[in-house]
């Protein structure tokens, strides 16, 4: 079995401001065990944008449905995109862990610019 | 050796759709992603769109949206490109091209061509 | 959509000298989170798909002479063969990875003068 490979396919999405910019991830395996999150920005002070676990996230939902047996695409769509919305986003694999997951491995990024609302 | 192998030339009636084949022979064909290009006679190489089959939708080109379809089936490790509505300056070699997945850098180029597929539309 | 300008149309170069083609986009394929630029070279020769040569901007594909080298960031970039040799003979095209459309560059022909 190959390695799990974390895709994000775009380097950049430009959404005008208003719409609903999607984010496309997927996985390559099932394995390990563990949640997808979905992240702006790197390092220490990295902003949870969604918790495929917990959490309530009212702008982001998922493009299909997680619950699903063998579901491998883990693609996002936030609602109604802001100015300050614009950055880098990350999708990452975590492992199942006790008592914290711990992260697996983190996809390539991709840059979200924000374009003025069309007058 | 991982190859991709396209079907054979076609001859079409303008107005008429063509359907174009490429299997992937090896490879993680699910993380690839599939471009088709094509290349009308004497002129430049040109991009219509791709799909990643894990994803399962594909991402087209402005010019040629809402008239071509690309699809893949992972069971055959196939991708397809249909094109509808089809006129004489749609005559060319169309080719499918692989662009493989690295970690944390992404798709880098297209590095695995077809031999491409010969579409001549004329009445 | 990402418009990539070649430069120029055809060139004719004596063997063994150097060749330099030119491809500028209509704006940044740098991904600043890894310092990546989404741009690639292929080589395509009469009757035969592209192959190739250059991703990254300036890696260099497996099994490419080391004569072929590239180069640039942000916006321009430079494919330059550093000794052309009868066999380099062809169409050079660039391409950009960075958003969708990847679009390609208009081609540059080399020949030898």
């Known amino acids: 079995e190959d390695e799990l490979q974390v895709i994000q396919p775009e380097k950049s999405v430009s959404v005008a401001a208003g719409e609903s910019a999607t984010l496309r991830c997927a996985m390559t395996s099932l394995i390990p065990v563990g949640p997808i999150m979905w992240f702006r920005g790197a390092g220490a002070g990295r902003e949870l944008i969604y918790n495929q676990k917990e959490g309530h996230f009212p702008r982001v939902t998922t493009v299909s449905e997680l619950t699903k047996r063998n579901n491998l695409d883990f693609s996002i769509s936030i609602s109604n995109i802001t100015p300050a919305d614009a950055g880098t986003y990350y999708c990452v694999k975590f492992r199942k862990g006790s008592p914290d997951d711990v992260e697996f491995k983190s996809g390539a990024g991709t840059e979200l610019s924000v374009r003025a609302k069309p007058s | 050796q991982v190859q991709l192998v396209q079907s054979g030339a076609e001859v079409k009636k303008p107005g008429s759709s063509v359907k174009v084949s490429c299997k992937a022979s090896g490879g993680t064909f699910s993380s690839y992603a599939i471009s088709w290009v094509r290349q009308a006679p004497g002129q430049g190489l040109e991009w219509m769109g791709s799909?990643?089959?894990?994803?399962?939708?594909?991402n087209y080109a402005q010019k040629f949206q809402g008239r071509v379809t690309i699809t893949a089936d992972e069971s055959t490790s196939t991708a397809y490109m249909e094109l509808s509505s089809l006129r004489s300056e749609d005559t060319a070699v169309y080719y499918c091209a692989r662009a493989n997945y690295y970690d944390s850098s992404g798709y880098s180029g297209l590095d695995l061509w077809g031999r491409g597929t010969l579409v001549t539309v004329s009445s | 959509d990402i418009v990539m300008t070649q430069s120029p149309d055809s060139l004719a170069v004596s063997l063994g000298e150097r060749a330099t083609i030119n491809c500028k986009s209509s704006q940044s394929v740098l991904f600043s989170s890894n310092n990546k630029n989404y741009l690639a070279w292929y080589q395509q020769k009469p009757g035969q798909p592209p192959k190739l040569l250059i991703y990254w901007a300036s890696t260099r594909e497996s099994g490419v002479p080391d004569r072929f080298s590239g180069s640039g960031s942000g916006t321009d970039f430079t494919l330059t063969i550093s000794s052309l040799q009868a066999e380099d003979v062809a169409v050079y095209y660039c391409?950009?990875?960075?958003?969708?459309?990847?679009?390609f560059g208009g081609g540059t022909k080399v020949e030898i003068k």
């Open positions: 799909i990643i089959p894990i994803f399962g939708t594909a």
């Open positions: 391409q950009q990875l960075f958003s969708t459309p990847f679009t």
